[in-house]
């Protein structure tokens, strides 16, 4: 996250980290005892789970082992349209007050509406520096409009923009996958933006998770 | 189809300054996402990057070149520019101009100019 | 800066042959590493991105694959056109990086 801040000690009890061995891979989000929401694009062949702790490679978090994942069938790696996977623990999570599995949308959230993104992503751009706190930025929803200004052929359909016009604050390598939080609601998984981070008036591309519910509730009830 | 034309003189003289200028066209040098390089390549040499521009103005050199180089823009005219001063004979290249998609997901060359012959001498 | 070894710096080959282009990267790049074709007196041209995806329009004889500091290139079946020369390039870290060239040609 760029330009951002710590987040409050346990704000985020859905927020997951997807490791490479110790090394952060992606951010991702608890949805179920045994499903965790990321970005098609943070696919391995297995992920190491770290869940309940705002410090990444903490040792008294939760870890499991993950080794089916199922990417959206539209995702393409080109042009990151349905940016959009599931990752099935090995072994459900224990829930706790540090462990608790976020709200799906309702509703799409309008723009204008003000979020948080959270991450343990590089904090500067383009020379790298990797917090081991969770870092938050709030953010406000922008609309399809308004950014296919900026992105014009980049913008997909089901992709949801979000920034604070004339700052920095963005997300960047490491957030991916990550939560995009509105009015308690996950609206967004971190998908892409521009490199290096931080450019004022390129927002933060996400997928508009609001568009892709149906989805998650079929894949989780198929893959029981 | 986006295209990239580089123009320019072909010979400059020792110590004086390059400029090379690429105009774009099939695509809007303002779009956010796609940014602006030049990349030269010495007589039967590898690829050397020089650095780019984006839609803001902002610009990243490569610092071995840092302090002969100033990349410009001009959005009106869809076009971006290249000075290099200070050249000796070891500026004597095929200078490219190129677009790259440069995302946090990925990042690469997607389309060139033809590249035009710069030879330093006197 | 990160450096590029590309190997080998030549190589001839008879056409349907399987030709391999390493690059080692001097550092981890995740799989921030594209591959060009250049042919003489024109530009390169994006073969590969992201190590192992295919650009838009490339024959599927050319393939990539490798992540962190190691990739490979490939052509399954060397055609008269692929007589070129492969760069690779890094494109983790700024400086962007390229490799010093494979220059194929056949036998």
């Known amino acids: 996250i760029i330009d951002g801040y710590k987040c409050k000690e346990g704000s985020h009890p859905w927020q997951v980290a997807l490791l490479k061995g110790n090394q952060l891979h992606c951010g991702g989000v608890l949805v179920d005892k045994y499903w965790v929401l990321t970005a098609a694009h943070c696919k391995m062949g297995q992920y190491q789970v770290q869940l309940g702790s705002d410090k990444i490679g903490d040792q008294s978090a939760q870890k499991i082992k993950a080794t089916k994942s199922f990417r959206h069938p539209g995702y393409s790696t080109k042009t990151h349209v349905n940016d959009i996977m599931l990752v099935r623990l090995d072994e459900p999570v224990k829930m706790s007050s540090k462990v608790e599995a976020v709200q799906l949308p309702e509703h799409c959230e309008p723009p204008g509406t003000s979020c948080t993104v959270s991450g343990w992503g590089t904090t500067t751009s383009p020379d790298v520096t990797f917090p081991s706190d969770l870092m938050c930025s709030d953010v406000k929803l922008i609309s399809s409009r308004e950014c296919k200004k900026v992105y014009k052929d980049l913008l997909g359909k089901t992709m949801l923009c979000a920034g604070i016009p004339d700052s920095k604050t963005n997300t960047c390598n490491g957030d991916s996958g990550g939560p995009l939080v509105c009015n308690d609601t996950l609206q967004g998984l971190v998908s892409w933006g521009t490199y290096p981070c931080g450019q004022p008036n390129d927002p933060g591309v996400y997928t508009q998770v609001c568009k892709y519910k149906r989805w998650v509730m079929e894949t989780m009830k198929t893959h029981r | 189809q986006v295209q990239l034309q580089e123009s320019g003189p072909g010979l400059v003289k020792p110590s004086q300054t390059l400029s090379l200028t690429c105009t774009v066209s099939g695509g809007s040098i303002s779009s956010g996402g796609y940014y602006w390089h030049w990349i030269r390549q010495h007589p039967g040499k590898g690829l050397e990057w020089i650095g780019y521009?984006?839609?803001?103005?902002?610009?990243y050199y490569n610092p071995s070149l840092k302090s002969r180089v100033t990349i410009s823009v001009d959005t009106s005219k869809n076009q971006f520019s290249l000075k290099l001063s200070s050249v000796t004979a070891a500026d004597t290249a095929v200078y490219y101009c190129?677009?790259?998609?440069?995302?946090?997901?990925?990042?690469?060359?997607?389309?060139w100019g033809q590249g035009t012959l710069v030879t330093v001498s006197s | 800066d990160i450096q590029m070894t590309q190997s080998p710096s030549s190589l001839s080959a008879s056409v349907g042959d399987r030709v391999t282009i390493t690059c080692q990267a001097s550092?981890?790049?995740?799989?921030?590493l594209n591959w060009y074709q250049q042919k003489p007196g024109k530009a390169p041209k994006l073969l590969i991105y992201?190590?192992?995806n295919l650009e838009t329009g490339v024959p599927s004889r050319f393939s990539g694959s490798g992540s962190g500091t190691d990739f490979t290139f490939t052509i399954s079946s060397l055609q008269p056109e692929d007589i070129a020369t492969y760069y690779c390039?890094?494109?983790?870290?700024?400086?962007?990086?390229f490799g010093g060239g494979t220059k194929v040609e056949i036998k």
């Open positions: 550092q981890d790049i995740a799989n921030y």
């Open positions: 992201d190590a192992s």
């Open positions: 190129a677009r790259a998609k440069q995302l946090t997901t990925h990042r690469y060359f997607d389309y």
């Open positions: 390039q890094q494109a983790s870290d700024l400086p962007f990086t």
């Open positions: 521009i984006y839609r803001s103005g902002y610009t």
